[in-house]
């Protein structure tokens, strides 16, 4: 419940300044506090609107101040109301003229249902008139003028809730402005009972605390706190947690405190009288000085706090031995908590002596709902209450309050909870490319609905027609490749964003569907690439017999090694060759092929070939004659690639012999790079020529090489490396 306090200073109005201050003590932001005239209690009071101002000394307080000259307009009943969402708390009070003919014994009087009650007014002015008593502005009783006693009483032998109200007394010739008021509050239940059926037993409220008939909680008088009101506040403080302070020179002197029903109004501890300006007599303390100190062991009696017990003693009269009580403290609770919508288990941790119990720790939501712990444990020094909010949502954001109320006192700690909306992508991911077993995806994680920052992203995928769970991969980039997919399968894709904090996984975003390609056929077998002319190459392969009924074709890709020139050719599947034309002479080409249906097949290995040359071949280079014996010698050479060299010719003759007496050795495999001449004469000089042939003609040797064989007895020279034809 909201801690609302109305300070009436002073209820008896003379020609001094007087005021009403309404304080919403503590932590919760409220709808505006209102102060108004209580026409329910007194219908015929002054109608003037009140000038309500903000109390600058307090965050949540409103004030009405009447200057001396307005004194005549003040008489009447007033209320202060505070609201928290569904809950409205109204505190009532009255103001009356100090010069009234009668004065009430007390401003309010709280009784239990069934009590024997006397409402009394003290006669302060003697007049030769009848006395009249009204309830809520309606006449109920009169006393003939010669019978008006010093104490005018209304007797209710068996008080009922309907007896509650504002009772006023005056002489018959008087009016509202000479009336005295007192308010009777009748608890809905009999003494010490509470609950809808009044069948629960109240906690024993000490120091004149009052048991609330709806909640069973003690409403503590100003200056006391805790579950049983046993704990005295520090000097001149008040409020449910003793956080508010009386700023007067003499503390709370002249402040009448009015609290929610059924408490009513009283002085702060240490003060008494209708104006709360009289100090307690020795031996008395508490609100209205109604409590008597009966301190054991000669302990001191303080009019504000009661018995001041020595260490090791406790209780109202210091009658119990035991460890000194310690006001609870809330620990380890941050001022601000960011929570993801979903399940939430807030924790309140508190110290104190005695340690707070399960029932003494609560959590108050911003809408005023009071939660009780779902789980509870304690160590030697701390109690820990764990609350469960099955589903916290953004409207639950705001100031929450951990509240601990023990016999040793009460403490409240406000903290701010910010409930975040889990992120969800607005768009489905896009499929950039697919194969039979992979897909390239743009996850399109932005824009998204909800709160960031995004901690991680998951790409979820599953086959559409399988009752499989969603699989996922963590992704860091917007572009991601999904591998190991099934061919010719429809998949669903979506993206889930994860924000920081527990339970930060957002809803998956919109779903995209795509289908993987079928598995491709193997490449054609027996591929062969040969030059056909200076501008054509011929590619051949074995006939293809596909296993399915699907139409198919052969795709041939050719590209030039020397130039950036590529072409893809589609060949009907029933053919077994293709002529690649419009090529450049003397150029090397790389060719590969695959068999495609609706799905693309696998590429073959690369094949390379040169188109035929358009010029004579260059002369073989690096010609060497070695390993010469008496009857043989090895000739080696190198040739340049790309001139369509089909054969090498070695021509030799004995030096000095005629040209027509030469021997030609034609080597038709152009990859052979050395040859052994045999059957030579010993100790003979030979002239050797070597030249290359291609489709255009032969190369022209620039000069001849000489070879002299050895005498028959000599060993041969070393042989060079390379392919050799014997």
């Amino acid at each position: 419940a909201m801690d609302l306090i109305l300070i009436n200073s002073l209820p008896l109005v003379s020609d001094a300044e007087t005021s009403l201050t309404c304080i919403a003590s503590g932590w919760r932001p409220h709808e505006p506090i209102t102060i108004g005239r209580d026409f329910e209690a007194l219908m015929n009071q002054h109608q003037d609107p009140l000038e309500v101002t903000q109390d600058v000394t307090r965050e949540w307080a409103k004030k009405v101040v009447w200057k001396r000259e307005k004194a005549s307009k003040i008489n009447g009943a007033y209320f202060c109301e505070g609201r928290v969402r569904g809950e409205a708390i109204r505190i009532r009070t009255m103001k009356m003229r100090q010069q009234a003919s009668f004065l009430p014994a007390t401003l309010t009087m709280t009784v239990d249902k069934g009590d024997n009650v006397n409402i009394s007014f003290k006669k302060v002015l003697i007049k030769e008139e009848d006395a009249v008593i009204y309830k809520n502005g309606s006449f109920i009783h009169s006393v003939p003028r010669h019978e008006v006693p010093d104490i005018l009483e209304v007797h209710l032998p068996h008080a009922q809730p309907q007896d509650a109200g504002v009772y006023s007394a005056r002489y018959i010739g008087g009016n509202l402005f000479t009336s005295a008021f007192t308010r009777l509050i009748v608890r809905r239940c009999e003494a010490q009972k509470w609950g809808p059926e009044c069948n629960h037993l109240c906690t024993a409220c000490m120091n004149n605390g009052v048991c609330h008939e709806d909640t069973g909680e003690c409403i503590c008088p100003p200056g006391f706190m805790g579950r049983t009101c046993e704990k005295a506040c520090e000097l001149h403080t008040f409020g449910r947690t003793c956080k508010e302070r009386c700023s007067g020179q003499e503390g709370c002197k002249s402040y009448v405190f009015c609290l929610p029903d059924p408490y009513g109004c009283s002085c702060a501890t240490g003060w008494k009288g209708l104006q709360c300006n009289e100090a307690c007599h020795p031996g008395f303390y508490g609100p209205d000085c109604k409590l008597r100190c009966s301190c054991n062991n000669g302990e001191m009696c303080d009019r504000f706090q009661g018995c001041l017990c020595s260490p090791g003693w406790q209780g109202l009269q210091c009658e119990r031995e035991g460890i000194q009580r310690m006001t609870p403290k809330i620990v380890d609770l941050p001022d601000h908590i960011e929570v993801n919508s979903g399940k939430f288990n807030p924790i309140c941790k508190a110290s104190g002596w005695p340690l707070p119990t399960n029932e003494e720790m609560t959590l108050v939501k911003p809408d005023g709902t009071v939660l009780h712990p779902k789980d509870f444990n304690h160590t030697d020094h701390f109690s820990v209450a764990i609350f469960t909010i099955h589903r916290i949502l953004p409207p639950d954001s705001g100031v929450w309050v951990c509240s601990v109320n023990t016999v040793a006192g009460m403490v409240e700690k406000p903290f701010n909870i910010s409930v975040k909306v889990l992120p969800k992508p607005l768009n489905a991911p896009n499929v950039i490319d697919t194969g039979h077993n992979f897909a390239v995806i743009n996850i399109s994680s932005e824009p998204y609905f909800g709160d960031g920052p995004i901690k991680s992203k998951k790409l979820l995928y599953k086959p559409v027609n399988h009752y499989e769970a969603w699989q996922h991969i963590q992704v860091t980039n917007e572009i991601v490749t999904l591998n190991y997919l099934e061919p010719r399968t429809e998949y669903e894709l979506c993206v889930q964003l994860v924000r920081r904090g527990e339970g930060g996984e957002g809803h998956p975003g919109p779903v995209r569907r795509f289908t993987t390609a079928s598995i491709g056929l193997p490449p054609p077998r027996g591929l062969n690439l040969l030059p056909k002319s200076q501008t054509t190459l011929n590619l051949t392969w074995q006939p293809i017999f596909p296993s399915s009924e699907d139409d198919f074709y052969v795709e041939v890709e050719r590209r030039s090694v020397q130039k950036s020139d590529q072409q893809n050719i589609k060949v009907p599947g029933n053919l077994t060759s293709v002529l690649l034309n419009n090529l450049h002479p003397r150029e090397q080409y790389v060719v590969r092929a695959r068999v495609n249906t609706k799905a693309q097949g696998e590429w073959s290995e690369d094949l390379t070939a040169w188109t035929l040359s358009d010029i004579l071949p260059p002369q073989p280079e690096n010609i060497k004659i070695s390993n010469i014996t008496h009857s043989s010698a090895v000739i080696s050479w190198t040739i340049l690639d790309g001139y369509s060299i089909s054969s090498i010719t070695i021509r030799y003759k004995v030096q000095g012999k005629n040209e027509d007496q030469h021997v030609d050795v034609k080597i038709k495999n152009a990859t052979i790079t050395q040859y052994q001449l045999k059957g030579l004469e010993p100790e003979t000089a030979y002239q050797v020529d070597i030249f290359a042939e291609n489709n255009i003609g032969s190369s022209n040797p620039a000069f001849s090489h000489e070879l002299v064989t050895l005498p028959e007895s000599q060993a041969p020279a070393d042989l060079g490396g390379g392919k050799m034809l014997l």
Partner: antibody, heavy 121, light 107 residues
Framework: QVQLVESGGGLVQPGGSLRLSCAAS????????MSWVRQAPGKGLEWVSA????????YYADSVKGRFTISRDNSKNTLYLQMNSLRAEDTAVYYC??????????????WGQGTLITVSS | DIQMTQSPSTLSASVGDRVTITCRAS??????LAWYQQKPGKAPKFLIY???TLESGVPSRFSGSGTGTEFTLTISSLQPDDFATYYC?????????FGQGTRLEIK
């Protein structure tokens, strides 16, 4: 143990009004969100309205918005449903149901026995 | 509004059978789903919340699974007491909505 007892059902003419009550016991009433759920004869369940533990927040199904008002009195541990402008299609058993906790959007872990409302001329 | 669709509408089974009831949401509801059992003339009984968490006191033969839009309630070995109507309910957002119910009858 948790108990929810509905009352206030009966026969009412179209256009008439009725107020249902649900008396709760066995738990801290003010700490729980509460709902009304109805079930037309031979039909499925239909959520009608919900209210937060403090009474500060309320929600309604479109079919009853503007006609029904949910409220609670935490001092009496009682939930109410004020039904105005009743129609034949409002005929149903009305259940009072407790939310799993203070959360406004939850399942219902405890239900009353239901009270029948018949709207007919 | 989020639509909840249960299948099948009626299910015939025998004591000892394993049965599965499916509930589909028209949009993702994460894990915010509850299951109830209702017998004729009685109030619904809370079985499962958060799609898979068993309410205390509910026999372990009942189990729930699913997330997003597809959910299932499974009874591993049917007992005579299990023949009733079962409802799913989403609590992702207002208005709270129930499935149309699945009647589980004796074969």
């Amino acid at each position: 143990q948790v108990q929810l007892v509905e009352s206030g059902g009966g026969l009412v003419q179209p256009g008439g009004s009725l107020r249902l009550s649900c008396a709760a016991s066995g738990f801290t009433f003010s700490s729980y969100a509460m709902s009304w759920v109805r079930q037309a004869p031979g039909k499925g369940l239909e959520w009608v309205s919900a209210i937060s533990g403090s009474g500060g927040s309320t929600y309604y199904a479109d079919s009853v918005k503007g006609r029904f008002t949910i409220s609670r009195d935490n001092s009496k541990n009682t939930l109410y449903l004020q039904m105005n402008s009743l129609r034949a299609e409002d005929t149903a058993v009305y259940y009072c149901a407790r939310g799993v906790d203070s959360s406004m959007v939850t399942g219902f872990d405890h239900w009353g026995q239901g009270t029948l409302i018949t709207v007919s001329s | 509004d989020i639509q909840m669709t249960q299948s099948p509408s009626t299910l015939s089974a025998s004591v000892g059978d394993r049965v599965t009831i499916t509930c589909r949401a028209s949009q993702s509801i994460s894990r915010w789903l509850a299951w109830y059992q209702q017998k004729p003339g009685k109030a619904p009984k809370f079985l499962i919340y958060e799609a898979s968490t068993l309410e205390s006191g509910v026999p372990s033969r009942f189990s729930g699974s699913g997330t997003g839009t597809e959910f299932t309630l499974t009874i591993s070995s049917l007992q005579p007491d299990d023949f009733a109507t079962y409802y799913c309910q989403q609590y992702e957002d207002y208005p709270l909505t129930f499935g149309q119910g699945t009647r589980l009858e004796i074969k």
